[in-house]
């Protein structure tokens, strides 16, 4: 059962796992949610009746029954983790805490103009978990405007004390606001020989990389595969760090793989969700339950629905035993990973999918696409919407993309002369325009947010957000697309598609069925040569065939240029402008979405 409200002046008795320090009960709840075992917590607020050394303590708790006895205690605030909830969860915490000093290892001290600048510095520093900033009213003259970057083993403060005229806050890496590079490559036959901060068991290098990503101190990792010569180290995932933030030594070793934390890419690839099945693999751990199940998929569902289950092993039924049902072993451990991994015993293992809700919805795999052809099939581009205007009569105006449950990203030029959002309708999950009848459900538009610097498409800043009046319930036919990570600026996308209901050629009519075309990206230098009379800026991205023939076309404005990278679709461009339609040596020009991620997040996350 999902309980989101906090219980004031209430303490949960017993079940303690560990104690951390958090600046608020709300953040204590987030920490509990992300902890592998925590189901409940008790936070102590500052209070004259409490010993100041207990202020800001966040006691993480577990219970076999998923609840604990409640005791009345002034200044105690208790609650439940969000593990039991189905809604999307985020560790992003933009709050600034006034007059609080969050203690940790002060590894960097510098002057900053404001707390915001200090927070940005922390966000763009690979080691920084949180910061404390002495304001210009701070009593000690030499400490004024000093920005202290801090880290700890846990990522949370080692203590929190009251201190006048300082402010503290957390790194915004988990808000997708870091400019740090996103290095997704996994390097085969490589060992990073730096200090280990932790080690866990993992079935493959990808799971190891994801574990590294949500471990607060891990910057890179080395994984020893099941073919690693030293048996005791097989399936071992070593979580590593270094002072420079990069591996100091790379050693060539067969059957080992190494890679980096994906903390700067976490909004556009899954980092919590281990959805694969591992055949002929047994995960060992504390046994929670043994249940009969028809298949390993059914076993994974049972694990996902059991809030304390972290991973499972399924042993298929022997011949006709037990109505063809196998045994499903639901398991857990102190850190969420198996204590040992065994091979060759016939089991099928995997992890709970409960953690998938901690990843962005946009990372969910969608159905395989149809190769060839120009007409799309249902569910192929579930983020694509058709934006209709009702004035003077109802018709398709522009495309757009779902990027959040209340947000559509589109082009600013779509709103030429549009004075009010009242004349707009957003239809999602649509394949054919003919499906749209008078009684077809749509989303009304509450607000049109056009980029402040937009003038005309060809000058850039051709980007707009639509805030919907109601929220989109995600299904197979309507779900969000990931924004590119700022750390992905140097990625070369090779699998890009433009979609829309636009004209297939100049002087055509809007197509009934959603059209698709695979289009190669063109460098900005090449694009500039094709548009000598225009300035192709870094905030634009171009795509098209040299010989022409395939392009976005009329009716596709605002629609997505979607690129698949590492099995996840990213909204790389917004169809903006071009000369004519699929003309030779005239690529389409798109708004380069990665350059507007900050703007998008600022507008969509505004309180």
């Amino acid at each position: 059962e999902c309980v989101t409200q906090l219980l004031k002046d209430t303490c949960f008795e017993g079940g303690d796992i560990t104690t951390v320090f958090t600046p608020s009960a709300k953040y204590c709840q987030v920490v509990c949610t992300y902890h592998p075992r925590c189901l409940l917590f008790t936070f102590t607020a500052e209070s004259p009746s409490e010993d100041p050394t207990r202020w800001f303590t966040c006691v993480l708790k577990d219970s076999v029954t998923e609840t604990l006895p409640r005791v009345n205690r002034t200044a105690a605030i208790s609650g439940y983790s969000f593990k039991q909830c189905s809604h999307q969860i985020s560790a992003c915490n933009k709050d600034i805490y006034v007059d609080l000093d969050m203690k940790g290892i002060n590894y960097n001290s510098s002057v900053a103009k404001s707390a915001q600048e200090c927070q940005e510095r922390c966000t763009d520093d690979v080691h920084c978990h949180f910061f404390t900033y002495a304001t210009r009213q701070f009593p000690s003259l030499e400490h004024r405007n000093i920005c202290l970057l801090k880290h700890t083993q846990t990522g949370t403060p080692t203590r929190i004390t009251k201190l006048d005229k300082v402010v503290s806050g957390f790194s915004l890496k988990s808000c997708a606001l870091s400019n740090l590079a996103c290095i997704r490559d996994i390097f085969p036959n490589t060992v990073f020989a730096d200090s280990n901060i932790d080690s866990v068991m993992a079935p493959d290098a990808f799971v190891c990389g994801r574990i590294c990503t949500h471990h607060p101190g891990c910057l890179f990792f080395t994984f020893f595969s099941q073919e690693w010569p030293k048996e005791s180290q097989r399936n071992l995932c070593l979580l590593k760090t270094s002072e420079s933030g990069l591996p100091s030594t790379r050693i060539k070793k067969s059957k080992a793989l190494s890679g980096f934390s994906l903390q700067s890419c976490r909004h556009s690839i899954p980092v919590f969700c281990h959805s694969s099945f591992y055949h002929d693999t047994d995960f060992l751990g504390e046994e929670l339950d043994i249940v009969a199940a028809k298949s390993h998929e059914a076993c994974q569902k049972l694990c996902t629905n059991a809030v304390r289950c972290q991973f499972f092993t399924y042993t298929p039924a022997q011949a006709s035993c037990n109505e063809g049902k196998g045994k499903c072993y639901l398991k857990l451990s102190s850190n969420g990973s198996p204590t040992k991994i065994l091979h060759g015993r016939g089991g099928i293992s995997g992890y709970t999918l409960r953690l998938c809700k901690m990843d962005n919805e946009c990372t969910t795999k969608i159905k395989p696409r149809i190769v060839g052809g120009t007409a799309s099939v249902r569910g192929e581009w579930p983020w694509q919407v058709t934006l209709h205007t009702t004035s003077p009569t109802q018709r398709h105006l522009c495309g757009g993309s779902i990027i959040g449950n209340q947000w559509i990203l589109t082009a600013a030029h779509c709103f030429y002369g549009v004075e009010s959002p009242k004349i707009l309708r957003v239809y999602s999950g649509i394949l054919n325009q003919s499906e749209i009848k008078e009684d077809t459900s749509f989303f009304g538009v509450q607000e049109i947010i056009i980029h402040d610097q937009y003038k005309m498409a060809e000058s850039g800043y051709d980007i707009a957000l639509l805030k919907l009046e109601t929220t989109v319930n995600y299904t197979d036919s309507q779900r969000p697309i990931c924004l590119p990570s700022k750390g992905d600026r140097n990625v070369i996308y090779t699998d890009c598609w433009v979609t829309g209901w636009g004209y297939r050629k100049l002087r055509d009519k809007i197509q009934n069925t959603l059209q698709k075309a695979k289009i190669p990206l063109v460098t900005n230098e090449e694009c500039q040569k094709r548009y000598r009379g225009h300035k192709i800026t870094h905030k634009m991205i171009c795509a098209g065939y040299r010989e022409g023939g395939k392009d976005a076309c009329k009716g596709d404005s605002g629609g997505p240029l979607s690129c698949k990278h590492n099995e996840v679709w990213h909204l790389v461009g917004i169809t903006s402008w071009g000369e004519g339609c699929a003309q030779r040596e005239r690529p389409g020009v798109y708004t380069n979405v990665v350059e507007y991620v900050d703007w998008i997040l600022e507008k969509t996350q505004a309180v």
Epitope: H413, Y416, L506, S576
Partner: antibody, heavy 118, light 111 residues
Framework: QVTLKESGPGILQPSQTLSLTCSFS??????????VSWIRQPSGKGLEWLAH???????RYKPSLKSRLTISKDTSRNQVFLMITSVDTADTATYYC??????????WGQGTLVTVSA | DIVLTQSPASLAVSLGQRATISCRAS??????????LNWFQQKPGQPPKLLIY???NLGSGVPARFSGSGSGTDFSLNIHPMEEDDTAMYFC?????????FGGGTKLEMK
């Protein structure tokens, strides 16, 4: 409601500099997306766009006249100005100032007639 | 510069009949979804008034007997049924690229 009013010298001689003022109300040139254009129309003829100024002081001119035109604004006084140097009889026209947001030329002033005569 | 050519230069239409004015652009005024072409009406001694924007959208307070259509380079303005009050000059104008340009105008009279 939105209103714009042009004012100018009425009559001037060739080679002089024409100074026009547009005073407006009902909108602000501090608003993102907002702009004001100058458009002229010789008697009985077509319309010719001359210059535009955006809220952020970015300016656009008709290329063939760019060297003679200067558009400027005083946001606090809700005024936009146009200067045309070295006028001749071909510059005789009614001059309109027009509000243009992120859409078409929506609101026009009544126009001011400028005659260039020796 | 984008050149707009209007035809006919003048037109006389009977009361209640249809008036059609054409506007042809020297290059496309479309931008993948919007036709940046507008129509204005101007009566003697008055400034122009916006009738149609983005090829087919009615300006504020414009009667429904006015309609616009077209895309790319070919556009038309239709008035049906023609009323006495519609006697005026009509101009098309493109907003695709600077310099913004106007057509030469069509004089519409009552037959």
């Amino acid at each position: 409601q939105v209103t714009l009013k042009e004012s100018g010298p009425g009559i001037l001689q060739p080679s002089q500099t024409l100074s026009l003022t547009c005073s407006f109300s009902g909108f602000s040139l501090n608003t993102s997306g907002m702009g004001v254009s100058w458009i002229r129309q010789p008697s009985g003829k077509g319309l010719e766009w001359l210059a535009h100024i955006y809220w952020d002081d970015d300016k656009r001119y008709k290329p063939s006249l760019k060297s003679r035109l200067t558009i400027s604004k005083d946001t606090s006084r809700n005024q936009v100005f146009l200067m045309i140097t070295s006028v001749d009889t071909a510059d005789t026209a009614t001059y309109y100032c027009v509000r243009k947001g992120r859409g078409p030329f929506a609101n026009w002033g009544q126009g001011t007639l400028v005659t260039v005569s020796a | 510069d984008i050149v707009l050519t209007q035809s006919p230069a003048s037109l006389a239409v009977s009361l209640g009949q249809r008036a059609t004015i054409s506007c042809r652009a020297s290059e496309s005024v479309d931008n993948y979804g919007i036709s940046f072409l507008n129509w204005f009406q101007q009566k003697p001694g008055q400034p122009p008034k916006l009738l149609i924007y983005a090829a087919s959208n009615l300006g504020s307070g414009v009667p429904a007997r006015f309609s616009g259509s077209g895309s790319g380079t070919d556009f038309s303005l239709n008035i049906h049924p023609m009323e006495e009050d519609d006697t005026a000059m009509y101009f098309c104008q493109q907003d695709k690229g600077v310099p913004w340009t106007f057509g030469g105008g069509t004089k519409l009279e009552m037959k």
